[in-house]
């Protein structure tokens, strides 16, 4: 059963229904809400069968409604319950106040019932103009808002309404006057130079969009120079001014189309910078030293012109860093008058030119570099020089082909000669000499020298002389020769010359098969690419042939006899005896004896028989001349 339907208001736009029902399983409830005077169609709601209460929102304020409800169980409708109730009156806004007023904005506060409005509609209108109002909406939960973008010193009417879906409250209004635009603070000039100045000013932070600076020459009607700078700046460099000139500088702030009253300041730029006190002094014979004074302004650079007084066409220009106050100018002619000019450059401006004249000193002289006493590994140098000036002389020795390391000698300024040694033979050199005196080095003078050639081929030596030949040896520079030619000629020029060609690596030749005991001339030449050296020569006589002599027979017996002989000492390796009967009736007897022997007893022969005896020596495989004798054995 459905009963106890009660209806209570829920604010001005809603009703709350409560009912009771047995805890059967209602499928759902049907609720009908209708204005009592039936102006609008009824609203029907279906709610779940488990509910026993429901809110009905979105109704009209202060309006009587008839509410009826029935339940549905298994398609069966319960009897309808009805009740009547009215919605409450619409809420009104409380009060509106202006909490803060600035020159371009204000803060609006108001009161209102909680949750009553979806949003608030605020209108901002200049009081005395027909300009369109500014409209804005703010969420219904807010009770305060900022209104920016207003004009300074202006009357505004501000209205506010609370708005729900279909209802707007009676507007509340308030009138307000915005404040004046704030004034600028102080304008000062903090730095002044000849072509620029720096402005500083004070102002409330974040007030201005931008500042306008106007720079005007005080006594001129020329167009002013205007600059616009961001509102965040409090300082500004004003470049490009004229030196020694009075200027009026004005500054005003701008904010949303409003300009402050201008601030003004008068200032005079400084006079043009000048260079002062140019001094020129000599730095030896080939240079000058310049000193000058200048204010410590940031000179970009100095331009110096150096010119021989008598040669206006050939000037030397130098550009130097602006930090310098002195410079050496080298590379000038000795004993020459020069005119030196200087000007400084600051931000494109040239200072007036300063000039001075000075002469370089007379050049100390060196000359007559001479090379003498050349050997394969050394030479002597001599030269002339101005006395009493030089501290040291520098000698550089460079080989013309640049294959060797440069050798440098530093010797006393009192010397006029030098001995250069340890050089390679057959080498071309260039000798450079310069003198050093305090702060100067003379021009370098030079001479050429070539060390003599070493003998490429030398020390022809004859050794191992024997009756049939000898050994020829020589010395030669490594890799100097492609080949050697050894020529052997007998001293009497009776025989044809013998020529032997040897490779360039060989250094000796053993000669054999020559004639004993005669004179020979030996010549050795080297060949380089077909070019022949002058020959080395030597003369030699071959030894006489070693002799065996004085073959004697003694002490004859029936079967033999004793033989003795003489021979050159230390020549023979051994001796050979040949013995045969003169009638050739028996085989010959041949005996080989060792070299030291000079006698031999012969036995085993036939009695009373005549024998022919031959003896020769053997030396290095060659036989000496044979000596002979006849011997007869005794009767038995």
């Amino acid at each position: 059963e459905l009963e106890n339907l009660t209806v209570t208001e829920v604010g001005w736009d809603g009703l709350r229904l409560n009912w009771t029902a047995a805890d059967q399983a209602y499928e759902h409830f049907i609720i009908q809400v209708q204005e009592a005077n039936k102006v609008e169609a009824a609203r029907n709601l279906t709610v779940p069968g488990s509910l026993r209460a429901v809110d009905i929102p979105g109704l009209k304020a202060a309006t009587p409604y008839t509410v009826s409800i029935y339940g549905v169980i298994q398609g069966y409708r319960t009897p309808v319950l009805s009740a009547e109730a009215s919605t409450g009156e619409t809420p009104n806004l409380g009060e509106v106040v202006v909490a803060e007023v600035g020159w371009d904005a204000l803060k609006l506060n108001w009161t209102a019932p909680e949750g009553a409005y979806e949003y608030f509609f605020i209108q901002v209108q200049e009081a005395d103009t027909v300009e369109a109002a500014q409209n804005l909406t703010v969420p219904g939960g807010l009770r305060s808002t900022d209104l920016p973008g207003l004009k300074a010193a202006t009357h505004y009417t501000i209205t506010i309404r609370g708005v729900t879906q279909d209802f707007s409250t009676t507007p509340l209004s308030v009138e307000v006057l915005t404040e004046e635009v704030p004034d600028m603070g102080n304008l000062t000039v903090t730095e002044v130079s000849w072509d620029a100045l720096r402005l500083n000013w004070t102002t409330p932070d974040g007030t201005y969009d931008q500042f306008t600076i106007q720079v005007q020459e005080a006594d001129q009607v020329e167009e002013a120079h205007n600059l616009t700078v961001p509102g965040s700046l409090r300082s500004m460099e004003i470049p490009g001014l004229r030196a020694g000139t009075p200027y009026t500088v004005t500054l005003h702030g701008e904010v949303r189309g409003h300009s402050t009253r201008p601030l003004a300041v008068e200032v005079v730029t400084e006079d043009l910078p000048q260079l002062g006190d140019l001094a020129v002094s000599e730095v030896g014979w080939d240079g000058l030293r310049l000193n000058w004074t200048a204010a410590d302004n940031a000179y970009e650079h100095f331009v110096i012109q150096v010119q021989e007084v008598n040669k206006v066409e050939a000037a030397q220009n130098l550009t130097l860093p602006g930090s310098l106050r002195a410079v050496d100018i080298p590379g000038l002619e000795a004993a020459t008058p020069y005119r030196v000019s200087i000007y400084g450059v600051i931000r494109g401006y040239r200072t007036p030119v300063l000039s001075a004249e000075a002469s370089t000193a007379k050049e100390p002289e060196i000359g007559n570099l001479n090379v003498s006493d050349i050997t394969p590994e050394s030479f002597n140098l001599s030269w002339m020089a101005t006395d009493g000036i030089f501290e040291t002389f520098t000698i550089e020795i460079i080989d013309s082909n640049r294959l060797l390391e440069t050798v440098e000698y530093n010797i006393s300024g009192a010397e006029r000669t030098a001995h250069i040694s340890g050089l390679p033979p057959s080498t071309d050199f260039i000798v450079y000499l310069s003198g050093l005196a305090p702060s100067i080095r003379t021009k370098t003078i030079s001479a050429t020298a070539t060390t003599e050639a070493l003998p490429l081929l030398e020390n022809l030596t004859i050794s191992d002389i024997n009756p049939y030949g000898f050994t020829v040896s020589w010395m030669a520079s490594e890799n100097a020769f492609d080949s050697f030619l050894v020529t052997v000629v007998d001293s009497g020029k009776l025989l044809d010359p013998q020529e032997f060609t040897l490779s360039g690596t060989q250094r000796k030749l053993e000669l054999r098969g020559l004639i004993t005991g005669i004179g020979y001339e030996v010549m050795v030449s080297g060949f380089t690419q077909g070019h022949q050296t002058k020959p080395l020569r030597a003369e030699i006589v071959t030894e006489a042939e070693p002799e065996v002599d004085n073959l004697l027979v003694s002490d004859a017996t029936p079967d033999g006899f004793r033989l003795s002989w003489t021979a050159d000492e230390g020549v023979f390796d051994n001796f050979v005896l040949k013995i045969r009967d003169t009638k050739k009736q028996s085989e010959p007897l041949e005996i080989t004896l060792l070299a030291p022997e000079r006698t031999r007893d012969i036995t085993g022969l036939r009695e009373a028989t005549e024998y022919e005896i031959e003896l020769y020596g053997i030396s290095k495989g060659r036989r000496s001349q044979t000596v002979s004798a006849i011997a007869t054995t005794a009767m038995g």
Epitope: A453, T501, T528, Q529
Partner: antibody, heavy 118, light 107 residues
Framework: EVQLLESGGGLVQPGGSLRLSCAAS????????MGWVRQAPGKGLEWVSA????????YYADSVKGRFTISRDNSKNTLYLQMNSLRAEDTAVYYC???????????WGQGTLVTVSS | SELTQDPAVSVALGQTVRITCQGD??????ASWYQQKPGQAPVLVIY???NRPSGIPDRFSGSSSGNTASLTITGAQAEDEADYYC???????????FGGGTKLTVL
């Protein structure tokens, strides 16, 4: 009759290359040392390079070392001079010449002109 | 040049003329002598101590003393008018060197 005939000369730009050849006849080429001598216009003779009989040993003047290469092909009786990185000062008539072991250059070709110019 | 020659020498027809060549290498090596006529290749005229290739007239002779080599033409002929170059070796580093040449004029 000994004959040496050079070829391969011509006009070349500085930095360019040329290869000279010398065809030999009338003597035992493989038994002779060979060489190149040049003569700049209106100037004296300047030895350039030489090579031994088998080609295993080569010799160069300092002025051409590292730029010129001498070689020979005994099977073709031909001598070569490969010239790289040519300079204006290499402009000359280049002569091919032979020499026996114990005699300097005894036969010369008629020469080929090399002009190095841009 | 490592071998130094006089640039020009003249001789009357039939007279004797001596052309010299100086250089350190000539202390060790004999000079060789070449004759070159305009537009022609050089021709060897003297080599070694005093050797003439076949076909070279015997009026040409060579000699050497110290660092000087000489080419002598005894009874100069009109056809001897030419440039003469001395030639030698300077050892392994400079195996062939030429003198600067001497222009011989036969008057």
């Amino acid at each position: 009759e000994v004959q040496l005939l050079e070829s391969g000369g011509g006009l070349v730009q500085p930095g360019g290359s040329l290869r000279l050849s010398c065809a030999a006849s009338g003597f035992t080429f493989s038994g002779s040392r060979m060489g190149w001598v040049r003569q700049a216009p209106g100037k004296g003779l300047e030895w350039v390079s030489a090579i031994n009989e088998e080609g295993g040993q080569t010799y160069y003047a300092d002025s051409v070392k590292g730029r010129f290469t001498i070689s020979r092909d005994n099977s073709k009786n031909t001598l070569y001079l490969q010239m790289n990185s040519l300079r204006a000062e290499d402009t000359a008539v280049y002569y091919c010449a032979k020499h026996p072991p114990h005699r300097p250059f005894d036969y010369w070709g008629q020469g080929t002109l090399v002009t190095v110019s841009s | 040049s490592e071998l130094t020659q006089d640039p020009a020498v003249s001789v009357a027809l039939g007279q004797t003329v001596r052309i010299t060549c100086q250089g350190d290498s000539l202390r060790s090596y004999y000079a060789s002598w070449y004759q070159q006529k305009p537009g022609q290749a050089p021709v060897l005229v003297i080599y070694g101590k005093n050797n003439r290739p076949s076909g070279i007239p015997d009026r040409f002779s060579g000699s050497s003393s110290g660092n000087t080599a000489s080419l002598t033409i005894t009874g100069a002929q009109a056809e001897d008018e030419a440039d003469y170059y001395c030639n030698s070796s300077h050892g392994p580093r400079r195996p062939v060197v030429f003198g600067g040449g001497t222009k011989l004029t036969v008057l």
